[in-house]
Interface confidence: medium
């Protein structure tokens, strides 16, 4: 099973103009490696034309050399490609981003992007630790719905290989501190806790250290409490509809909710010749209700076939869950056959759907 | 329901094009990452591409890249591949799959395997 | 060639215990998130395990995962007819920037 390369690009608009060296990406990849440059407008806004240039000149496009602009990629790159790579505007020459690339003898240990750095001491480049995606770690909160599964990484590289370990809100941070544990995966530099609860709110600091120094990187979670609600109807649906005599129909009723909708589709009817009866409740007759083979899915969905003047009126679609009910109505009108349409059609007054 | 449903699949001739489609519903599509999976008649699964919900990260296997296209439209509810240049060795049944969602940073794939799949389309190359 | 390695296939009796092995390397197995997928005859994957041995709701308990190294392993305790399927074995590979399966195993229950 032969696979690419991965196609993720890195690195991140400077976010001032002429950023000092001091805010340049460092960025490291072994040889053979496409080495992946991106630097989006800043502030999203438009780029205008652009130029990529490496140790102050320009690069020229090539099979292995692509030029895009927002984007450079250099494939199979070699220690010769190492260097201060830096897109401008072609005519102001301002420097939007800056990079400074090392392609390493040693083939990299692959993907990353994903932080899972083969943890092992090459003899190359002995040194202190580094973020091998600092561009990935802008991002430092996450806010979370209760119950989901959360990872933080601090994907990093050192040799010797370094260690990592984890504090919440500045304590050493334990399986047994939460319930449920937690799951540390040293390889990845990860740290998951699953089915998180609000008492997991905080500020996590991954501490990553060798021998000749040390990294630390603070992420904050929020867990966000769902509030259990009645379910959420679509609005605009359904929507009215003009139908000619004998044609086809479809009401639609888009349903959202957490806990498990019960869907019902009621048509409106009199009797005798009331529309309400004593209490105010509408009298509705039962056109589609759940099943023991019937999907949410179909429930969306109430079909008509071959209508007549008698299925004119107001359909409801109506969802209840646990928590409540909510309903939308729309109106059906039948119009006679298209022959007795024909002056109504050249005036434009009628559209049959 | 969480559904997905592939459409497209047919018998083309090598070296043309197909696109296929995959249609999500149930779920909230933008929000996770998508991928294209094959298998051949009577072979294993191949892994063919992945893509962000962002549209930030693409990834292909070897097998396919320079071939294949893979896309999204949020909008929609949709995923696409557009396999051009087709071959023999292509003809497989393609399986659209979602991935669970994991509340990540740094943001990037979360492995956590395809948790939902769609029932395939059949791709035939052959003249 | 997979890069990941399955026995083609494995068989058991109802009852018994059945466990089927997955090799692979440093920058698959060895630091990433393993997952197991079931297909039954003339169906889609489903999957089964997911971060090594957790399980999706709805997959009995009869299943279960756990890696070591760079291998991993499914057990499927009290066998029973409807586990007649093919197993794969997958996870990401960080040094092809790939997901990748296992040939999968051919599993029989006698």
């Known amino acids: 099973e032969s696979l690419g390369t991965e196609q993720r690009v890195v690195g991140r608009a400077a976010e001032v103009p002429g950023p000092e060296p001091g805010q340049q990406e460092q960025l490291v990849f072994g040889s053979g490696d496409a080495v992946e440059l991106s630097c989006p407008p800043p502030g999203g806004g438009p780029m205008g034309p652009t130029v990529w240039v490496k140790d102050g000149t320009g690069l020229v496009p090539s099979e292995r050399v692509l030029v895009g602009p927002q984007r450079l990629q250099v494939l199979n790159a070699s220690h010769e490609d190492s260097g201060a790579y830096s897109c401008r505007q072609r005519l102001t020459q301002r420097v939007l981003c800056h990079f400074s690339v090392r392609v390493t003898d040693a083939p990299s240990s692959g993907d990353d992007e994903d932080g899972e750095d083969e943890a092992e001491d090459t003899g190359v480049d002995t040194g202190a630790p580094y973020w091998t995606r600092p561009e990935r770690m802008d991002k430092k909160l996450l806010a979370v719905p209760a119950a989901n599964t959360v990872r933080f990484r601090c994907p990093a590289a050192g040799n010797p290989t370094p260690s990592i370990s984890w504090l919440k809100n500045g304590r050493e941070f334990r399986g047994e501190h939460r319930i449920g544990g937690i799951k540390l995966r040293h390889q990845q530099w990860s740290l998951v806790m699953e089915s998180v609860v609000p008492s997991d709110r905080g500020n996590y600091t991954c501490v990553v250290e060798n021998k000749f120094g040390s990294i630390r990187q603070t992420y904050t979670l929020d867990v966000l409490e769902r509030s259990p609600h009645r379910p959420i109807l679509q609005a605009g649906l359904p929507a009215n509809q003009t139908a000619v005599l004998g044609s086809d129909v479809e009401f639609h009723c888009k349903v959202y909710s957490d806990a498990q909708p019960h869907i019902q589709w009621l048509k409106h009817v009199e009797v005798n010749g009331s529309k309400v009866g004593p209490d105010g409740t509408p009298y509705v007759t039962v056109l589609k209700t759940a099943g023991a083979n019937t999907t949410d899915k179909e429930l969306e969905v109430l079909s008509l076939h071959n209508v007549t003047f008698e299925d004119a009126g107001e359909y409801t679609c109506l969802a209840g869950n646990s928590i409540g009910f909510s309903h939308h109505s729309a109106w059906l009108v039948v119009l006679p056959a298209e022959e007795e349409l024909v002056e109504a059609d050249e005036a434009g007054s009628v559209y049959a759907g | 329901e969480v559904q997905l449903l592939e459409s497209g699949g047919g018998l083309v001739q090598p070296g043309g094009s197909l696109r296929l489609s995959c249609a999500a519903s149930g779920f909230t599509f933008s929000s996770y990452y998508m991928s294209w999976v094959r298998q051949a008649p009577g072979k294993g699964l191949e892994w063919v591409s992945g893509?962000?919900?962002?549209?930030?990260?693409?990834y292909y296997a070897d097998s396919v890249k320079g071939r294949f296209t893979i896309s999204r439209d949020n909008s929609k509810n949709t995923l696409y591949l557009q396999m051009n240049s087709l071959r023999a060795e292509d003809t497989a049944v393609y399986y659209c799959a979602k991935d669970p969602l994991i509340y990540e940073l740094p943001i990037g794939y979360s492995s956590y395997g395809m948790d939902v799949w769609g029932q395939g389309t059949l791709v035939t190359v052959s003249s | 060639q997979s890069v990941l390695t399955q026995p083609p296939s494995a068989s058991g009796t109802p009852g018994q215990r059945v466990t089927i092995s997955c090799s692979g390397s440093?920058?698959?197995?060895?630091?990433?998130?393993v997952n197991w997928y079931q297909q039954l005859p003339g169906t889609a994957p489903k999957l089964l395990i997911y971060?090594?041995?957790n399980r999706p709701s709805g997959v009995p308990d009869r299943f279960s995962g756990s890696k070591s190294g760079t291998s991993a392993s499914l057990a499927i305790s009290g066998l029973r007819s409807e586990d007649e399927a093919d197993y794969y074995c997958?996870?990401?590979?960080?040094?092809?920037?790939?997901?990748?399966f296992g040939g999968g195993t051919k599993l029989t229950v006698l």
């Open positions: 971060y090594d041995s």
């Open positions: 997958a996870a990401w590979d960080s040094s092809l920037s790939g997901y990748v």
């Open positions: 440093s920058s698959n197995i060895g630091s990433n998130d």
């Open positions: 893509i962000y919900p962002d549209d930030g990260s693409i």
